[in-house]
């Protein structure tokens, strides 16, 4: 099973050496967006109804305080990056902590300058990993030197960072916001007419959890080749569940030969193409 995870993504920008006021931030819980930083309100806000319903007001106060502090640190760090030429630059920090099935924990943070990874840190061991490129090496040295001057960036600070992240993750799990549950998908198949006797059939799976799903078209029970199908990304739907789709083109009149095959969390099912005038077939969830 995938570990439970809490991930924060912060970004600050600078233009011609001028660092923006404020920062951009979002948070993901078990891969689901649950938090965004509203720079107009200067507040962490719930993202998605599920986060708003389950997590109390104190959550957003705590998250705001922590993000503000992290954002200020990131702004100060960007100010000290020496190689800034003219133009727009970004400094991004992705911080992740995980709780695995065997109760072991992991914690890391990763720094990107203009989208390029230049430093990864293990928050438990304080070990740093720097990519081989000379630019990454220079940036990492630049940043770690600045942190050494900053008394806050001690080993105790990193341990506290990890403990704080895990504490939040455990609290969110207890609140039931990310209880490991299986929500089977709703599957529906739609047809749309296309010229020259071909039709496009689309199979949509929605409101499922966890994220992993197999969705594919079959002809006479055999899966179609990859290059004859078009897949959508598996995306959060804002309700703590996911959605995706797969489409293919078939000859009109051959609808009965095609089925949409779905496999999710050990369950599977096939969904036929609607024939004749009934161009939409809704397959209800079977819990």
């Amino acid at each position: 099973a995938e570990p439970h995870s809490l991930r924060y993504n912060l970004m600050v920008l600078s233009q011609d050496g001028s660092v923006q006021s404020g920062f951009l931030a979002e948070g993901h819980l078990d891969g689901q967006p649950f938090l965004r930083y509203d720079r107009q309100k200067r507040r962490a806000k719930p993202q998605g109804q599920w986060a708003e319903n389950v997590l109390g007001a104190k959550t957003w106060d705590t998250e705001t305080e922590d993000l503000t502090e992290n954002g200020q640190d990131l702004r100060r760090t960007l100010t000290h990056i020496k190689d800034q030429k003219g133009g727009l630059h970004s400094l991004q920090e992705i911080r992740v902590c995980e709780i695995h099935e065997d109760s072991s924990t992991r914690g890391s943070r990763h720094f990107y300058y203009d989208g390029e990874l230049f430093l990864s840190q293990n928050l438990e061991t304080q070990e740093s990993t720097v990519p081989q490129s000379s630019r990454a090496q220079t940036l990492a040295m630049n940043v770690t030197n600045f942190w050494k001057e900053d008394a806050m960036k001690t080993k105790t600070h990193y341990r506290a960072m990890q403990a704080d992240c895990l504490q939040k993750l455990q609290r969110y799990l207890k609140s039931g916001v990310a209880i490991r549950r299986t929500v089977p998908p709703m599957v529906n198949v739609t047809c749309s007419e296309v010229s020259e006797g071909n039709i496009t059939v689309t199979c949509r799976a929605s409101s499922f959890y966890p994220r992993n799903i197999t969705l594919t078209w079959r002809q006479d029970g055999v899966s179609l080749s990859h290059n004859t199908q078009q897949w959508g990304d598996v995306l959060p739907d804002g309700n703590g569940t996911y959605q995706t789709w797969v489409a293919t083109r078939i000859r009109q009149g051959e609808e009965q030969r095609f089925t949409c095959y779905m496999e999710h969390s050990g369950n599977h099912g096939t969904h036929p193409v609607p024939s004749g005038k009934a161009l939409v077939l809704q397959s209800q969830r079977t819990d």
Partner: antibody, heavy 116, light 107 residues
Framework: EVQLEESGPGLVKPSQSLSLTCTVT?????????WNWIRQFPGNKLEWMGY???????NYNPSLKSRISITRDTSKNQFFLQLNSVITEDTATYYC?????????WGQGTTLTVSS | DIVLTQTTSYLSVSLGGRVTIACKAS??????LAWYQQKPGNAPRLLIS???SLETGVPSRFSGSGSGKDYTLSITSLQTEDVATYYC?????????FGGGTKLEIK
């Protein structure tokens, strides 16, 4: 509905301190946003003076830093501007406004004249 | 400090006409710009944020565009109630600053 209303003395003598109050109704100043003071000089030029955020942190325009203080009284849902050692060039209409980046709600403004 | 320049101080346009008001920043502000309308005796009113996002309740004849250092407020089909002074404001970095304003009149 969110409403902001400025109040103040109208006339202040040079070298004195100016104190203005912004009373907010329909929204708690401790909920979120930053709460700003902006002034408009007789020639219509607008100047952002500073803010106090919902958490109580402040940020001031460096051009006023040595003279300005923004505070609040959360029990009355009010925030205040104090400007020390005023000069005639501080004559302006003073507005309070809500916003952490841009300003979506403004008071109607209070006119302040600095004159002996 | 970032300086915002509104080169046109006054604009005279016919009713029903189209207006564009320019705002130039002294540095790139990456769309972190707002537009306000101010009528005599009133406080400024927010029209547009993030260079292009129209505020709720603002008529669709108003629109914002631009990027980098150069931004524009456009008004199509000018109405009498649009007579006002228009200001731009950036929020890239503090101190936040305003443009000098463009006063719009009916020809």
């Amino acid at each position: 509905e969110v409403q902001l209303e400025e109040s103040g003395p109208g006339l202040v003598k040079p070298s004195q301190s100016l104190s203005l109050t912004c009373t907010v109704t329909g929204y708690s100043i401790t909920s979120d946003y930053a709460w700003n003071w902006i002034r408009q000089f007789p020639g219509n030029k607008l100047e952002w003076m500073g803010y106090i955020s919902y958490s109580g942190s402040t940020n001031y325009n460096p051009s006023l830093k040595s003279r300005i203080s923004i505070t609040r009284d959360t029990s009355k849902n009010q925030f205040f501007l104090q400007l020390n050692s005023v000069i005639t060039e501080d004559t302006a209409t003073y507005y309070c406004a809500r916003g952490g980046t841009y300003f979506d709600y403004w008071g109607q403004g209070t006119t302040l004249t600095v004159s002996s | 400090d970032i300086v915002l320049t509104q080169t046109t101080s006054y604009l005279s346009v016919s009713l029903g006409g189209r207006v564009t008001i320019a705002c130039k920043a002294s540095a790139h502000i990456n769309n972190w710009l707002a537009w306000y309308q101010q009528k005599p005796g009133n406080a400024p009113r927010l029209l547009i944020s993030d260079a292009t996002s129209l505020e709720t309740g603002v008529p669709s004849r108003f629109s914002g565009s631009g990027s980098g250092k150069d931004y524009t407020l456009s008004i199509t089909s000018l109405q009498t109630e649009d007579v006002a002074t228009y200001y731009c404001q950036h929020y890239w970095s503090t101190p936040w600053t305003f443009g000098g304003g463009t006063k719009l009149e009916i020809k």
